[in-house]
């Protein structure tokens, strides 16, 4: 019996409007209701969490109104975008899976999806 | 800095109810998952119970099951281990811990409060 | 239910050994380990987080490894300070089981 795997891209680079999207996928080892999907930015040793959302399996997931994060569902396949990242923002971001009913709880984490966040140079004034 | 302290333990009669609390400081409470373990007289470390972020999923150890009820106060930032019907081998220290926010190890520690369960 | 067992259920070693404490869980539990150390009237203390990650302000004689189902703390060189007893805990499932532990005494 092999332990959960959450799979997601090693790299992707956020558009120049500060948007980032990944997918997350995970291999379940039971039939989860109740999934929490959590997004934690590694910086150094520090972890700390970018949004969180719980969904039941069918329906769609919901991030907070005030979260940086929209995401979609499908299966065992998320779709997570974030936004409004500037460069400072760039670093490892972690997708944690969570399947949190029914009983057993199981965890799943992946191996983190460094994004690279360039801000935009500003335009330069225009002379007409 | 992160601070748990346990309260409520003492001395009952088999078959009756005690109230545990946990009074947690210096992190969100709401983003962590809390968990009760207990550690008998000369024994060894038993997992007990988990309620994880609003409080809506909660998890037992088979031991305690229909006996024990985990339940959590964001507001109030303090957990909870409601223990009903207890029995002589309920009898430990109870210590309320902290998951990690990444892989649900234990870093925080709360001191630990007695329960003796006798007759 | 996942299972921890642990080995030896004790062992008497002398400062300055290279002490190795074994894990084993009864599934797969990827590299969801953690070591905690124990000493007598106090709470546990995490040592070693995700089989092989060294907890801030723990000395670095310290050392986990291992993966799926078989891990191993290794103590490199036996101080003082480190006669107790530690146990391994899996937090990949629940129930999140400790295993047995084991006792470091001095020989």
């Known amino acids: 019996c092999k332990a959960m795997h959450v799979a997601q891209p090693a790299v992707v680079l956020a558009s120049s409007r500060g948007i980032a999207s990944f997918v997350c996928e995970y291999a379940s080892p039971g039939k989860a209701t109740e999934v929490r999907v959590t997004v934690l930015r590694q910086a150094d040793s520090q972890v700390t969490e970018v949004c969180a959302a719980t969904y039941m399996m069918g329906n769609e997931l919901t991030f907070l109104d005030d979260s940086i994060c929209t995401g979609t569902s499908s299966g065992n396949q998320v779709n997570l975008t974030i936004q409004g990242l500037r460069a400072m923002d760039t670093g490892l971001y972690i997708c944690k899976v969570e399947l949190m009913y029914p009983p057993p709880y199981y965890l799943g984490i992946g191996n983190g999806t460094q994004i690279y966040v360039i801000d935009p140079e500003p335009c330069p004034d225009s002379d007409f | 800095q992160v601070q748990l302290v346990e309260s409520g333990g003492g001395v009952v009669q088999p078959g009756r109810s005690l109230r545990l609390s946990c009074a947690a400081s210096?992190?969100?409470?709401?983003?962590?998952?809390m968990h009760w373990v207990r550690q008998a007289p000369g024994k060894g470390l038993e997992w007990v119970a988990v309620?994880?972020?609003?409080?809506?999923?909660?998890h037992y150890a088979d031991s305690v099951k229909g006996r024990f009820t985990i339940s959590r106060d964001n507001s109030k930032n303090t957990l909870y281990l409601q223990m009903n019907s207890l029995r002589a081998e309920d009898t430990a220290v109870y210590y309320c811990?902290?998951?990690?926010?990444?892989?649900?190890?234990?870093?925080?520690w709360g001191q630990g409060t007695l329960v003796a369960v006798s007759s | 239910d996942i299972q921890m067992t642990q080995s030896p259920s004790s062992l008497s070693a002398s400062v300055g050994d290279r002490v190795t404490i074994t894990c084993r869980a009864s599934?797969?539990?990827?590299?969801?380990l953690n070591w905690y150390q124990q000493k007598p009237g106090k709470a546990p203390k995490l040592l070693i987080y995700?089989?092989?990650s060294l907890q801030s302000g723990v000395p670095s004689r310290f050392s986990g490894s291992g993966s799926g189902t078989d891990f191993t703390l290794t103590i490199s060189s036996l101080q003082p300070e480190d006669f107790a007893t530690y146990y391994c805990?899996?937090?990949?499932?629940?129930?999140?089981?400790f295993g047995p532990g084991t006792k470091v005494d001095i020989k």
């Open positions: 210096g992190f969100t409470f709401s983003s962590y998952g």
């Open positions: 811990a902290r998951g990690d926010i990444l892989t649900g190890y234990y870093s925080y």
């Open positions: 599934q797969s539990i990827s590299s969801y």
């Open positions: 995700a089989a092989s």
């Open positions: 309620i994880w972020y609003d409080g809506n999923n909660k």
């Open positions: 805990q899996q937090s990949y499932s629940t129930p999140f089981t």
